[in-house]
Amino acid sequence: SPIMNLEQSPLEEDMSLFGDVFSEQDGVDFNTLLQSMKDEFLKTLNLSDIPTQDSAKVDPPEYMLELYNKFATDRTSMPSANIIRSFKNEDLFSQPVSFNGLRKYPLLFNVSIPHHEEVIMAELRLYTLVQRDRMIYDGVDRKITIFEVLESKGDNEGERNMLVLVSGEIYGTNSEWETFDVTDAIRRWQKSGSSTHQLEVHIESKHDEAEDASSGRLEIDTSAQNKHNPLLIVFSDDQSSDKERKEELNEMISHEQLPELDNLGLDSFSSGPGEEALLQMRSNIIYDSTARIRR
């Protein structure tokens, strides 16, 4: 865990950052420069050397561990994303299959995320319908597993390979939204050429009992006309603006180093005309192909 890594002192970390800046500069003896900077800094602190830490004896403060655990376990404390993409379930015709206390719900999503965006988080939101006798106070205890249906390659067309994306136990007393983290899958989908992806939701009884009236039933609402249609939400960051800024900086540096380039009349601050338009065109193509399904 990042908090446990206390062996490198903050000063050394900062020095290593300086290393990145200076190491590529010609004519600078970086080690000498680093040593002299270090000596000067230590002199101001009235120290002869960087104090050593015995990592075995150093325990992080309790509040730091709590903070780490909060961010490690609380998915809602995600870094801010500046783009939100939502995709509705496109499989409007398949019905859930049920046998031996297991119910299977097929879902289909047409997902398209430009390659220059970084996917921060992705979640599948499912509305769970708890159906039980109102006289019975107990809730419904179920295991939900989200599978990705992988494309079959080669001869075995009939076989379906499935990959578990996420699973969890749900104890429900009321119908409500449940959220499942599918970030890794979406990052894979972004890299793949394909835009159509099939998921399957499995709901099984926790205690191997077949569902009956007394134990109640848990279902996923997949009705197309319903406000509770399964939703895939992708939180992403547009890195193109960062990339543009880096390119601008690189341009400025190269202009500094090679003044003769200025004569070419290059405008380092003009952005390429096409990316946004191309993305929009691509989106429109996707729209054309999926709108028919929607209608």
Epitope: N82, R85, S86, W177, D238, E276, S283, N284, I286
Partner: antibody, heavy 126, light 112 residues
Amino acid sequence: SLEESGGDLVKPGASLTLTCTASGFSFSSSYWICWVRQAPGKGLEWIACIYAGSSDITYYASWAKGRFTVSKTSSPTVTLQMTSLTAADTATYFCARGRYYVDGYADYYPGDFNLWGPGTLVTVSS
Amino acid sequence: DIVMTQTPASVEAAVGGTVTIKCQASQSISSYLAWYQQKSGQPPKLLIYLASTLESGVPSRFKGSGSGTEFTLTISDLECADAATYYCQSYYYSSSSSYGSAFGGGTEVVVK
């Protein structure tokens, strides 16, 4: 950050242009700039949004169409032109950055407002 | 146009207590709802978007739930700093009716 300017005391029937200036980030295709107002002691009221990318897509509240015009001038500024002002337009006007939402069918639109300016006061009085 | 109705207009609770604010949309807006906190003389601050997603840096004491037309903001373990006015906002797009945004009337939270 965002900062509004141009707020003033004007007479009924007058026109006024407010400016929203962004600093610390440049306008890009991944968000919207929106205007929201708040009359003294009252709630928030959405006015309009403009896409910060290269195309000029705008959305207006139905009550604001015709009298209010949002436009991008030179980056990084967005203006809100207001005409035929009345006492009911007296309010603090905020500009806000709207998150960029896309639905699966390639329609994109402003979402929640995750960055706000401090506001500028417009007073309409004779 | 979508109309957002927020209740109650004002609520009072003790430090450490819990406050629940409700917001009702005049038509279904799926999960496209945000919650803001506004203190006197300041601009609003985003707390929650997409009905239940916590904005970066906002304490997990703030919890949003709901979808369609009924939404709830719950503030638990109330602190004095939570005294403010809270607003819900819908931001709904449909290819048939275009885009619209609307705020609720606000709920003043008083912390004793």
